[in-house]
């Protein structure tokens, strides 16, 4: 005989669990319907009536199939050092990420709670490890024969130009200056053989913002369904 299709709510067979998009309610001791993403449980199921779902209100969401009594509050608006990469909808929370030139110093479940400006390496120091979304720049002193004359979160130490005759030796924060005879580093004919000025590509810094606000008893369970022998069900 073909198995009868059970309609929620129903008592699960011993040794089985509820089906996909259903859950086992501890109070009713029944398999009941979940609410879809964007909804929540307005009325919980009983032995004789199924879950009643309702849409999430503005600025609240549920992303999962659920039976929560209230939708979750979306996180607060993104701060000035952040970009909103996902808007708050009934099915998803707002996600804020750090804008260019900043990194996430304190992450949260999704996105970033606190952004901080990327460190800038001062003259005499270059970038050893670039910044990422979640890590700051690491600076290192320029080794002999290399220099950096910028305050930058991106510039690395560069080799000194090699002169036939040195006018001013280079150091960690300044390139070598050659006399008017050509340096061995190739340059176009007729060019002025002085080091080219390097723009200090420093980005304006802002003070680190305050973090944005994000949004027992012992017991024995009733004789419920034995959990499944094979793969899991539900969402």
């Amino acid at each position: 005989l073909p198995a009868q299709v059970a309609f929620t709510p129903y008592a699960p067979e011993p040794g089985s669990t509820c089906r996909l998009r259903e859950y086992y309610d501890q109070t009713a001791q029944m398999c009941c319907s979940k609410c879809s993403p964007g909804q929540h449980a307005k009325v919980f199921c009983t032995k004789t009536s199924d879950t009643v779902c309702d849409s999430c209100e503005d600025s609240t969401y549920t992303q999962l199939w659920n039976w929560v009594p209230e939708c979750l509050s979306c996180g607060s608006r993104c701060s000035s050092d952040q970009v909103e990469t996902q808007a708050c909808t009934r099915e998803q929370n707002r996600i804020c990420t750090c804008r260019p030139g900043w990194y996430c110093a304190l992450s949260k479940q999704e996105g970033c709670r606190l952004c901080a400006p990327l460190r800038k390496c001062r003259p005499g120091f270059g970038v050893a490890r670039p910044g990422t979304e979640t890590s700051d720049v690491v600076c290192k002193p320029c080794a002999p024969g290399t220099f950096s004359n910028t305050t930058s979160s991106t510039d690395i130490c560069r080799p000194h130009q090699i002169c036939n005759v040195v006018a001013i030796p280079g150091n960690a924060s300044m390139d070598a200056v050659c006399t008017s005879t050509s340096p061995t580093r190739s340059m176009a004919p007729g060019a002025v053989h002085l080091p080219q000025p390097v723009s200090t590509r420093s980005q304006h810094t802002q003070p680190t913002p305050e973090p944005s606000t994000a949004p027992s008893t012992s017991f024995l369970l009733p004789m419920g369904p034995s959990p499944p022998a094979e793969g899991s069900t539900g969402d």
Partner: nanobody, 123 residues
Framework: EVQLVESGGGLVQPGGSLRLSCAAS????????VAWVRQAPGKELEEVSC????????NYADSVKGRFTISRDNSKNTLYLQMNSLRAEDTAVYYC????????????????WGQGTLVTVSS
């Protein structure tokens, strides 16, 4: 849809220790309250321990208080149960289960189950 796989069970002598793991895939475990539930042969289900969605609250059955510790590692998407001073009466199949956005313990209902891991305490 989250899938759960338990591991770490086995045979241990009374007074011994085990650490159970529950690895989640398909969804982030930190969206859920998670619990360890056990069932001994011929006995009813018992929720051994629970940790809420926010991770701010845990709960233990009286029978395991002071001996078991629940924890979660969201970066590994895994739930743990450290079981110390094991007793013969702890022998059961241990399951992890979830409640989406569950804010209190014990759980109001059970969502996804793993396949279970058998813990046997015997000399």
């Amino acid at each position: 849809e989250v899938q759960l796989v338990e591991s770490g069970g086995g045979l241990v002598q009374p007074g011994g220790s085990l650490r159970l793991s529950c690895a989640a895939s398909g969804s982030r475990l930190d969206y859920y309250a998670v619990a360890w539930v056990r069932q001994a042969p011929g006995k009813e289900l018992e929720e051994v321990s629970c940790i809420t969605y926010s991770g701010g609250s845990t709960n233990y059955a009286d029978s395991v208080k002071g001996r078991f510790t629940i924890s979660r590692d969201n970066s590994k998407n895994t739930l743990y149960l450290q079981m110390n001073s094991l007793r013969a009466e702890d022998t059961a199949v241990y399951y992890c289960t979830t409640e989406p956005y569950g804010s209190s313990c014990p759980l109001s209902g059970y969502d996804t189950w793993g396949q279970g891991t058998l813990v046997t305490v015997s000399s």
